[in-house]
Interface confidence: low
């Protein structure tokens, strides 16, 4: 059979080369002389020439030693052709598997590995993992299977077997109790990796195990009592820095302090954070303090570490007395945001509302008012009473200043304290609609055919709100109803414009009057382009080229030629003779009734 089983060839073969591997043989060689060839990477494509075949015998040859670590498998194709070059067999798969030799030793991925473990941990605690790799095969052979071991440990305190290494994973673990950072802060292990699962070549590296500090000292406040003065109303104000000492390793989790307010802050006015460099507790205001409500706060602050205590330790507490200093406070509008309904278009001088502020201070201070932001300039405010009046025309439909029927104004109140303070309020005027806009059709330009015209549907928009909108009514004015009809649909929100008499191709003004539910009327001129066409149209087509009939093709061509000649002559005549005054558009259009065939030539 024209089949070859996979061929296994060891890497680094000594030869002699070329070395015979296997013979390709086609049973078609009884009928004709067969020539054999091979193709594929390793034969005729890179790396070329590793394999060859004896053309006439079919012996597959290896020309040089193989390196499994470069290429582990070659996939070639065997071919058999007759003397005339005709293929006598389908290409045959030839798989050459390169088998491994132990020609690489293990290599640690680092010269020095670093790991750490807490002092006092129990035996069995994992410290770190080291890795060595071997380029040889570890699946079908032991050549690339690495076994790990510890060769030596320095120092040998409290004894020389403090650690063990898992022979296959390289995980280093604690094997004995007694790790004490204060006595031995670091161990150096010489580790080995040996291939052939421990029976082959060996390589070494160093594993440094750092013994980490356990939290066996509590932080202590120095001093334990603090007193501070803070102005009222200030948020984020630094009240006090609290200092602690800790005997554990500086900048470690066992040394870094964590502060908590454990008493005296029922109103949740304060917060305490740890300063990243000094390890101090920074006490700040989370909310503004109110002198009028409480002029002194006594806080109790507790300190622990980022790491939990390793042994039972007492927790230190400090006392902070906070005195609140009185300051002049800004007036506060009541409410801070006021919603008022007012009809649009009210007369100038008409009152809108009264908007006043209260002063939180205990003294009776005088408050004066003014408008801070009035984008359209529609309002004025009495400085003493806070009375807001209209000085311009409030327009609900003004899209530049009004959003969702609301006009937003910002007002200011100022007290007469020393120094004076100000507060702001927001006035939201909800503008009530009046029927001050008539309905408008959209679009205001249409294009329509003068034969079998499609009805033009125009949308009706009215800037006012219901009930000052639909249903709408439509009426044609200025004799537009002679040629056109206008009807409002059942829903009353669109108007349908139809051509009822034939008009020649031209542009016409259609006078359309629309009125809303409140009888507010609006006259709009629609620009109608009438085209010589049937049915639907976007833009007017070119001039007509003959009758409606479908005559013979010869007659059609002659007709076109005649039309073109007439058009050229007509063009010259038009240039020479001055044009006659055109008749009124509608008069001229009335000559032919709608539905007739329009045969005028529009040169």
């Amino acid at each position: 059979d024209w089949v070859v089983a996979p061929i296994s060839v060891p890497e680094n073969g000594k030869g002699p080369f070329p070395q015979r591997l296997n013979q390709l043989k086609s049973n078609k060689d009884r009928d004709t002389k067969i020539f054999y060839s091979i193709t594929g990477p390793g034969a005729d494509s890179p790396p070329e020439g590793v394999f060859a075949v004896e053309k006439e015998t079919g012996w597959l040859l290896l020309n040089k030693p193989l390196d499994r670590e470069e290429i582990a498998k070659y996939e070639l194709f065997g071919h058999a052709v007759s003397e005339n070059g005709a293929s006598v067999e389908d290409p045959m798969n030839i798989s050459i598997i390169v088998t491994d030799q132990n020609d690489h030793k293990p290599k640690f991925t680092q010269d020095t590995f670093r790991g750490s473990v807490l002092e006092g941990v129990l035996p069995g605690t994992s410290v770190m993992q080291v890795t060595a790799t071997d380029e040889d095969d570890a699946i079908y052979t032991y050549n690339g299977v690495v076994a790990y071991s510890i060769h030596s440990q320095e120092p040998k305190d409290p004894h020389d077997l403090m650690f063990t290494i898992h022979r296959s994973t390289g995980t280093i673990s604690v094997i004995s109790s007694g790790l004490d950072r204060e006595k031995v802060p670091e161990y150096t292990l010489t580790i080995q990796a040996t291939d052939m699962d421990g029976d082959g070549s060996t390589t070494t590296a160093v594993a440094v195990v750092e013994i980490l500090d356990a939290n066996d000292n509590a932080p202590m406040f120095e001093p334990q009592k603090y007193e501070a003065w803070v102005p009222e109303n200030e948020v984020g104000h630094e009240v006090q820095r609290l200092t602690v000492t800790d005997l554990d390793v500086p900048n470690s989790p066992a040394w870094r302090a964590t502060y908590h307010i454990v008493g005296g802050d029922d109103g949740d006015h304060f917060t305490i954070t740890t300063h990243p460099e000094t390890n101090q507790g920074v006490l700040t205001t989370k909310k503004g303090l109110d002198f009028e409500a409480q002029d002194q706060h006594t806080l109790y602050v507790e300190v622990t570490n980022e790491a939990p205590f390793a042994v039972k330790l007492p927790t230190a507490t400090a006392t902070v007395v906070v005195h609140v200093k009185d300051v002049n406070e800004a007036p506060v509008f009541v409410p801070p945001s006021k919603v008022v309904e007012v009809q649009e278009g009210i007369p100038t001088g008409e009152p809108v509302c009264v908007y006043t502020a209260e002063d939180p201070d205990k003294e009776n201070q005088k408050i004066s008012y003014r408008i801070l932001r009035d984008p359209a300039g529609w309002l004025a405010m009495d400085p003493d009473s806070g009375q807001v009046t209209a000085v311009g025309t409030l327009d609900r439909e003004d899209e530049q200043f009004v959003r969702n029927n609301i006009y937003e104004v910002m007002v200011l109140a100022m007290d007469n304290g020393s120094p004076p303070t100000t507060g702001t309020g927001t006035l939201l005027l909800t503008l009530i609609d009046v029927n001050d806009h008539g309905p408008v059709p959209e679009p205001r330009q249409i294009t329509i055919c003068n034969q079998s015209p499609v009805r033009q549907v125009l949308n009706i928009t009215d800037k006012d709100l219901s009930p000052h909108t639909s249903p709408f009514q439509a009426q044609l004015t200025d004799d537009s109803d002679i040629y056109w009809t206008a009807e409002v649909n059942e829903e009353g929100d669109t108007v349908v414009l139809s051509l009822k008499k034939f008009l020649k191709q031209d542009t016409y003004d259609v006078h359309l009057s629309l009125s809303d539910h409140g009888n507010k009327e609006q006259l709009t001129v629609i620009r109608a382009t009438v085209c010589d066409c049937h049915g639907h149209v976007e833009t007017c087509p070119g001039p007509w080229k003959g009758g409606s009939g479908g005559g013979g093709s010869g007659a059609g061509v002659i007709a076109v030629i005649v039309v073109v000649v007439i058009a050229i002559v007509a063009g010259i005549v038009v240039l020479v003779i001055s044009r006659k005054k055109r008749m009124a558009k509608y008069e001229k259009a009335e000559i032919k009734e709608m539905g007739e065939m329009h045969r005028e030539l529009n040169a």
Epitope: S45, P46, E70, K107, D111, T133, E135, T203
Partner: antibody, heavy 121, light 107 residues
Amino acid sequence: VQLVEQSGAELVKPGASVKISCKASGYAFSSSWMNWVKQRPGKGLEWIGRIYPGDGETKYNGKFKGKATLTADKSSSTAYMQLSTLTSEDSAVYFCARQRDYGALYAMDYWGQGTSVTVSS
Amino acid sequence: ELQMTQSPASLSASVGETVTITCRLSENIYSYLAWYRQKEGESPQLLVYNSKTLAEGVPSRFSGSGSGTQFSLKINSLQPEDFGNYYCQNHYGFPFTFGAGTKLEIK
């Protein structure tokens, strides 16, 4: 910070040899391959070969066998390349470049600044 | 020997544009292809290895893709510092061949 520092420019006569160096710092020199790459003026990059300083294992591009010899000194974290029997074709900038692992997984991530070798009589 | 065809040989683009450079190989190298940028008078800088892994410190506007014999490097929103020569490199089989390079110039 990983650094690969190369020796200065060399002007050598045809037929002579030159040895250029590459000093590494900031990483495990012994367990990373050091590659050497050639670049002729205005041309592309050509891989010469690589050395594993841990045990001196080398791999060469066939084109440079007999031309380049790669060595390494672990104690000084320095890799060397000697170019012999120089001709004008050897005039180029030679870069050394670290390869983080000795398998196929990694490319050359830290490069020296290059050493210019000019062969002229 | 493994053949590498890098295209285009040169490319002109403006800051903010997106460009793509391709690298075609004569045989399968799986995903083991790297991309480097070399500015005039400087050493090459590793951008991408293993076809699509960004090297440390390389901005995310660079992205590599492909496997087998067809690879590409895409640079989104070109910055002034992105101009220079770009090389692809096989880091699978010996010898570690480089592409002929693509010169990316400012338009």
